[in-house]
Amino acid sequence: ASNFDCCLGYTDRILHPKFIVGFTRQLANEGCDINAIIFHTKKKLSVCANPKQTWVKYIVRLLSKKVKNM
């Protein structure tokens, strides 16, 4: 659900951390309409997710930890 690199809505699916290689934060005050986490998957798809949802926060935390430990 994205247009010109902006997420316009959120996925209705839950993704597993093993499917995700990284993420980008989209901020509503930086040219896009909504806040979002854009997950980048192993299938080279970009998935727009709701940053308020617990499962999204969990994956962001996991990935952030991984980066810190590198």
Epitope: I14, H16, F19, T54
Partner: antibody, heavy 120, light 107 residues
């Protein structure tokens, strides 16, 4: 110890709705998902959906096309599963089960099951 | 939706046998796979999570392996209490889907 206690067996007529409860104890209720899985006679396991008690987020199997609704009462650590427009194929044992991020999204504790019979 | 296919659908074996159950996914699920055991009249029990990790309290005769689309549950030496139905489950992406089950019976 972790316990999930479900409500008792139900007999319903086709077209009716059923609401099954699942009361959790022995762990921090808002830290884990609650899934619902069913097993019809002679069939395999089927995932119906989940609810996150911390933010009431729900995710449903579209196979049920809006017939299933999951709700939560955090004050009593209880999750409810309502299935509407019942048909004979909905006759099954319904389970609530805890979803755990820590075991790779596995379902690590299960309720005892609730038999729902749909019959005219 | 991701489809999960188990084989065989039923299996006869004896106490002490080594048994292997396979599970295939319709696409790569990157190890996001769990195994459950179900006995008649009882709730399912988590055996293996993340394709290879043994759940708490599960005997070490159970093991899981695999990657990509193909996964295996192995019981190294069957015990009388192991006769049950086994299910694999995809947790890569919702809807979470189960295999149709493998019923393990006494020969």
């Amino acid at each position: 110890q972790v316990q999930l206690v479900q409500s008792g067996a139900e007999v319903k007529k086709p077209g009716a709705s059923v609401k099954v409860s699942c009361k959790a104890s022995g762990y921090t209720f808002t830290s884990y998902w609650m899934h619902w899985v069913r097993q019809a006679p002679g069939q395999g396991l089927e995932w119906m959906g989940l609810i996150d008690p911390s933010d009431k987020y729900t995710n449903y199997n579209q196979k049920f096309k809006g017939r299933v609704t999951l709700t939560v009462d955090t004050s009593t650590s209880t999750v409810y599963m309502e299935l509407s427009s019942l048909r004979s194929e909905d006759t099954a044992v319904y389970y609530c089960t805890r979803g755990n991020y820590g075991v790779d999204y596995g379902m690590d504790y299960w309720g005892q099951g609730t038999l729902v019979t749909v019959s005219s | 939706d991701i489809q999960m296919t188990q084989s065989p659908s039923s299996l006869s074996a004896s106490v002490g046998d080594r048994v292997t159950i396979t599970c295939g996914a319709s696409e790569n699920i990157y190890g996001a796979l769990n195994w459950y055991q179900r006995k008649p009249g009882k709730a399912p029990k988590l055996l293996i999570y993340g394709a290879t990790n043994l759940a708490d309290g599960v005997p070490s005769r159970f093991s899981g392996s695999g990657s990509g689309r193909d996964y295996t549950l192995t019981i190294s030496s069957l015990q009388p209490e192991d006769f049950a139905t086994y299910y694999c489950q995809n947790v890569l992406i919702t809807p979470y889907t189960f295999g149709q089950g493998t019923k393990l019976e006494i020969k």
